[in-house]
């Protein structure tokens, strides 16, 4: 059961219910576990994990990344700006997570779990955010054409894209977790 659902808390009546921050923290760690499981399948299936050609393909993908200006690093840390960046970044990752859905054979359910858990995480974070006006939602039409473009790539590029999405999403979540623990 994903940590976004309450069954574990119900099963342990003597335990203090998780705070909002603890639930977010737990949710991110759950998603990272899922990403790691998906990485195993991609690395076993192709040699992408050892590839040095990452940079070539990375130029064609506009994956969300933390930068100094986002206020998530300790130097220049800004809670509100950072929270907006985390939510915006996760919303931008959603189209890439959708792309991953038919990319796995034995880990199909895991890919779905990562996608659904990310949606839950976004909901948790939106409740925490005060300045929801600053959060820009990606344009559905743009996302649809991006998805079509990604799915039209040759096999090698699709494998590389899958690898890069998982690696970038992992690093984005790690940065987010570090920042959220400062809040």
């Amino acid at each position: 059961v994903p940590p976004g659902e309450d069954s574990k808390d119900v099963a342990a009546p003597h335990r203090q219910p998780l705070t909002s921050s603890e639930r977010i923290d737990k949710q991110i760690r759950y998603i990272l576990d899922g990403i790691s499981a998906l990485r195993k399948e991609t690395c076993n299936k192709s040699n992408m994990c050892e590839s040095s050609k990452e940079a070539l393909a990375e130029n064609n993908l506009n994956l969300p990344k933390m930068a100094e200006k986002d206020g998530c690093f300790q130097s220049g840390f800004n809670e509100e700006t950072c929270l907006v960046k985390i939510i915006t970044g996760l919303l931008e990752f959603e189209v890439y997570l959708e792309y991953l859905q038919n990319r796995f054979e034995s880990s199909e359910e895991q890919a779905r779990a990562v996608q659904m858990s990310t949606k839950v995480l976004i909901q948790f974070l939106q409740k925490k955010a005060k300045n929801l006006d600053a959060i820009t939602t990606p344009d559905p039409t743009t996302n649809a054409s991006l998805l079509t473009k990604l799915q039209a790539q040759n096999q090698w590029l699709q494998d590389m894209t899958t690898h890069l999405i998982l690696r970038s999403f992992k690093e984005f979540l790690q940065s987010s977790l570090r920042a959220l623990r400062q809040m």
């Epitope: 991110i28 760690r29 990272l32 790691s36 990485r39 690395c43 994990c49 050892e50 690093f73 300790q74 130097s75 840390f77 690696r167 992992k170 690093e171 790690q174 940065s175 977790l177 570090r178 623990r181 400062q182």
Partner: antibody, heavy 127, light 111 residues
Framework: EVQLQESGPGLVKPSQTLSLTCTVS??????????WSWIRQPPGKGLEWMGV???????YYKPSLKSRTSISRDTSKNQFSLQLSSVTPEDTAVYYC???????????????????WGKGTLVTVSS | QAGLTQPPSVSGSPGKTVTISCAGT?????????VSWYQQLPGMAPKLLIY???KRASGIADRFSGSKSGNTASLTISGLQSEDEADYYC??????????FGGGTHLTVLG
Amino acid sequence: EVQLQESGPGLVKPSQTLSLTCTVSGGSIATSYYAWSWIRQPPGKGLEWMGVIDYDGDTYYKPSLKSRTSISRDTSKNQFSLQLSSVTPEDTAVYYCARAGLGDSYYLGTYYAMDYWGKGTLVTVSS
Amino acid sequence: QAGLTQPPSVSGSPGKTVTISCAGTTSDVGTGNFVSWYQQLPGMAPKLLIYDVNKRASGIADRFSGSKSGNTASLTISGLQSEDEADYYCASYRSLNNVVFGGGTHLTVLG
């Protein structure tokens, strides 16, 4: 008990590539959320972190060494390796391999705590 | 980018307490609880003493303790013993999956 052992040539010529391997026993490098690091120490000087390969096989390098450094792993042999290209006499050092990953390191990407170390191997760069 | 700043040497008498400082910036020591301390005896590999600022590694005596204030971390060794004479290094996570060490401090146990 986890044990690490560095191996490789003790003498490398300037401009060549230094290659070292760390063999891990007492635990699999593919298990759990540990990461595997390389650290070096020039004679009479302090420790310098060079880079790490994490549980997923992702690598991170010290920015000033990034262009010359490559870390890889072979899970079937339970080994991970370091390659440092275009070496100069300044790269002469004792090279250590170590395990990192205590606490929430994997989830946070913070591999600064290394709990098991190899004994180290001295590599001299000289013609 | 420079490493963390440690005093080159400290000394103390047996049974006394010494503290070694490790000064960094908001990009490393100041970020979260990401500080570790190592002891290196002559001719040996470093040994982890403290991680996450103040957690003792497995098998480490409670004479060793760690703390942090702002951008400076500290290692305190109480009940000083002759076998504590060694080099001590701090390390910290630095932005973007990078690790940085201090320059090292040599501890001399007097007498």
